[in-house]
Interface confidence: medium
Amino acid sequence: RTVPPMVNVTCSEVSEGNITVTCRASSFYPRNITLTWRQDGVSLSHNTQQWGDVLPDGNGTYQTWVATRIRQGEEQRFTCYMEHSGNHGTHPVPSGKVLVLQSQR
């Protein structure tokens, strides 16, 4: 069986004019998935991205995420690329985004 992922892109504000954009894929099967950030259509280098492992979400399907830090104002240049079971798609950073403020630690 194949269950395509639901993909969601969110932003959170960080210091010094940078924001963290996170791309989450959920409710997909099988487990193999490609999830990576692209800038102007080109995949970012591995060391500029952070990934979560691909883990069960409790419904017989899986979830994972990838995040990267970008300059605020350059959101339109970045897309999250997803490939799963022969299907693929790109997901932009939402332009009318609501920033989730991270609490100071």
């Epitope: 490609t34 492992d53 490939e83 022969g86």
Partner: antibody
Framework: QVQLQESGPGLVKPSETLSLTCTVS????????VHWIRQPPGKGLEWIGM???????DYNAAFISRVTISVDTSKNQFSLKLSSVTAADTAVYYC?????????????WGQGTLVTVSS | EIVLTQSPGTLSLSPGERATLSCTAS???????LHWYQQKPGQAPRLLIY???NLASGIPDRFSGSGSGTDFTLTISRLEPEDFAVYYC?????????FGQGTKLEIK
Amino acid sequence: QVQLQESGPGLVKPSETLSLTCTVSGFSLTTYGVHWIRQPPGKGLEWIGMIWTDGTTDYNAAFISRVTISVDTSKNQFSLKLSSVTAADTAVYYCARKGHGYYYAMDYWGQGTLVTVSS
Amino acid sequence: EIVLTQSPGTLSLSPGERATLSCTASSSVSSSYLHWYQQKPGQAPRLLIYSTSNLASGIPDRFSGSGSGTDFTLTISRLEPEDFAVYYCHQYHRSPFTFGQGTKLEIK
């Protein structure tokens, strides 16, 4: 830095169980999974199986009836057990970290340990 | 299972020359899941190129990869003495995750 170290008996008798451990440092076992791969002397690489961070496993069908891969997070160790061994199981056994992200490649390897199956 | 066939089995070249190594899959492999490893005698393999064309950390840019579908290539633009080793392609597209039989790159 990231390190993986395989250990276990270098000699195993036919029909017995091969048991190896992979002790890791420099990364969290709750964040990265591990593959086990073997290489018979003078031959190529063969994937045995892997364990994900939630403890679930994927095995090569060629080994599935006699292989078990597990993790002990308290000891920072992964383990491989291969039962009912024969001379054909003589090989260098490697553990390798399952890289993250969009490729799942084996980004760091142990140095390998040679296991000889002989009576 | 997906069988990866590497050619040639042995490649004899001199330092400074260009090396082209081929990996052919028995069925289509996503470029995201095709990787190359280098192995020197007595050592463990090390990740060279991941996802067909991305250099792993610390790998010099004389190495490059390309391809799609069933045909993939590893190219070393100008051979250095330390490049003589065995090279394996590897697919993570479908279990069991298989390796090619290897190409031995030796000094001519």
